[in-house]
Structure formats: C-alpha cells, structure tokens
Interface confidence: low
Amino acid sequence: AQNITARIGEPLVLKCKGAPKKPPQRLEWKLNTGRTEAWKVLSPQGGGPWDSVARVLPNGSLFLPAVGIQDEGIFRCQAMNRNGKETKSNYRVRVYQIPGKPEIVDSASELTAGVPNKVGTCVSEGSYPAGTLSWHLDGKPLVPNEKGVSVKEQTRRHPETGLFTLQSELMVTPARGGDPRPTFSCSFSPGLPRHRALRTAPIQPRVWEPVPLEEVQLVVEPEGGAVAPGGTVTLTCEVPAQPSPQIHWMKDGVPLPLPPSPVLILPEIGPQDQGTYSCVATHSSHGPQESRAVSISIIEPGEEGPTAGSVGGSGLGTLALA
C-alpha cells in the first residue's frame, strides 16, 4: 500500500490507477476507516450521506473535501480499462494536525543551586497524532531522569476534536558553581515524520547559590557550664553568617519565651535554671540551624569540678556536665 499523509481539514484526492479518464467507467472504491464498520463500497454513481465525506470524481479519483481523524485507514480502488485489464490501487491514509507553537507557562525566574526546582511547564495544544515534547538546555537536549533532571508528562485528548494537548513539567537540580543564567526551551516533535519541530521562546532563569551557614557555635561562661548557687552563666551564640540571623533560645528542647538575642544571661542561678540549653539561628534564606546543646548545672562548694560526658536526647552534638 502507498502511504499518504493528509492534514486535518484539508481536501484529499486519491487517484484510481488504470481507470478511464471519463465515464463510462467500471470501478469501485473500498474504504476501511474509522467511519466504517469493515469495508464500505463507493461507486461513481454516488449519492447519499457519504457524498459529504467522500465521493468519486468523473475521472475516477476519490475526493475527500475535508479530511478528519476518522478518515485514517485503507482505501482501495479496483478499475477495469476499456480493454478489460484490471488495475488495483491501494492507499494507507494517515492524518495529522500541527499544533500551535508550544509555550512555557509557570516559568521560574529564579532557581536554587543544589536543590530540585520546577523550571516550568511546556504546553502544546491541538496536535494529531499526539507527538512529543522535549526540553533543551542551552540548545542541547535534556535527558530526563539523569543528573538532576526529571520530567512529568501528561497527555489529554479533546473529547470533541480528538486532538491532543501535551504538558511537560521540568524539574532540575542546578549544580553549584554552574551557569548562573541557563537557557531552557521546549520543543514539540510531531508524531508523523517529515514535519519540523516547533520550539518555544527560551526562558533564562537566574541560578541563586545559597551560601551554606557555617556551624553555629555556643560558648558558655564559666567554661563547662557548672556554677555555684547564685552565680551567673552567660551563653553566647556565634554565627559567622552575614547578615546576622535571628537567634532564639531553647531549654530542654522547648523554646524560651524571650526576644531574639545572641546572648542569654542567667543571673543568680537556682535549681530551676538547671537543664540543657541550645540556640537556634534562623536566616531569612535558610532554614533554622541549631547549635550543640550544653548542660547547665549547679555545683555545691567542695564538689569536684566539671567533667565532660554525653547525654542522649535530641541527637545533636551534646556536652553533658556533671
């Protein structure tokens, strides 16, 4: 069979080989398409509702005024010339529709290095057959599910027109120290060959590199955190990051109802002040970061000095003091 591709909505003429150029003709067309149950026979006489879909022209060719999805299938013509010689024509018809230019919607203006980010959603509407969407970085194809690239695809079919809408959501994890202004684009490749790809306008998000917070240091005075009753303990939370983050304090894993401050002073220590203290630094562009925990305890005069040990609990680096 000879392969024929026709655009949806366009007219199509199929020649009946060997047929006399004008009547009288001995020929018949047989169709097996989405419009037929098994084979439908059409003759030059025509007539009836099929004339609006397909009719035999005076020269024996079959004319379809506006090809639709239901016209995909096999078309056969059997003709006999004036000398009684029989000729058969056999066509396999496939239809296509080129969608509008794809678009990137929900596009991100900024990506964060080192974490997964949604770049955007590529949308193509009105294709047949469905075709495919693919993403490009700086003009080169991106391979999904490889090196921090993932793609979520969705295909929907319009209930009335039968045309396809494709959606493709791109997630990437930009490498630290990589290109600060990558260029992404998306292209639609038709399901039938010989039709060129349609490409979106490119997008150029910025890549933001978060500066990792250095470790939050908790300094205790007196060193070791053991103090005589009535003494004073000073806890200082040191964070090298700029601008200075907000510092909150925790005791035994519970936030203390105090205004943010890098210094916590415990004057005139009593039994109620004993416990495990830590500070939490919250930077505007990072999550909270907790220091190691230190244990504040009261020692009676004449007791041994503090010794380092460890206590379980929060899983943080913990310094327990006797």
Partner: nanobody, 117 residues
C-alpha cells in the same frame, strides 16, 4: 474579522482587586485558547494566565492564588479576576486569542493596570 475588546483596567491600591474583561466578536471563541499577558515597563511580555477551550488553566507562579481566569462561552468573554494586587503587578495587560491550532492568533489593544499607594 475577529475583534478583542478589553475593559476593566485602572488604578488600585496594594491589596485591592480589579476584574479585566475581554469580549470577542465571532463564533470562534468557544474553540479558542484565551490568555492574559502582561508587560511591565522595560520588561518582556509574559503570560499571566491562560484558559483552554476545555477549561484547563495555567498561571504564572507569582500570580497563583491571587489571579483567576475564567470564560463565559455564552457571552464570548474571558475574565481575569485579580485580587491582593501588588506593586509588581503594574503593567499593560493584553488579551490573546489562539484558535484553529495556532493558525488564528489575535491580540487585544491592552489595558493599563496600575497598583500604587
């Protein structure tokens, strides 16, 4: 000839609301994808919201939850309801119609939205 007639722009304070309308002449509306685009001074035009003929919608990340696009096929009109407006929403807003698989493409003349205190 398809025509797009826009209305509803204006001056509004931050946090306020506006509703843009785009009325389309011609029978092509029901099978068209409609979009609202915006262009701020010195910036590229960007797609703020779109609605397909089947009713599926997409939004620019920065307007999600604040803007709602809808269509009334009986009135051949598409709407953009803009709530909790911010200073950065100031732009000229354009209505766009795409139909017949992108072969038909029309733009409205644009309407100014200014968010200012």
């Amino acid at each position: 000839q398809v025509q797009l007639v826009q209305s509803g722009g204006g001056l509004v304070q931050p946090g306020g609301s506006l509703r843009l309308s785009c009325a389309v002449s011609g029978s092509i509306f029901s099978s068209a994808t409609m979009g609202w685009y915006r262009q701020a001074p010195g910036k590229q035009r960007e797609l703020a919201a779109r609605i397909s003929s089947g009713g599926s919608t997409n939004y620019l990340d920065s307007v999600k939850g604040r803007f709602t696009i809808s269509r009334d096929n009986a009135k051949n009109t598409v709407y953009l309801q803009m709530n909790s407006l911010k200073l950065e929403d100031t732009a000229v807003y354009y209505c766009r119609l795409q139909a017949n698989f992108g072969l038909v493409d029309y733009w409205g003349k644009g309407t100014q939205v200014t968010v200012s205190s």
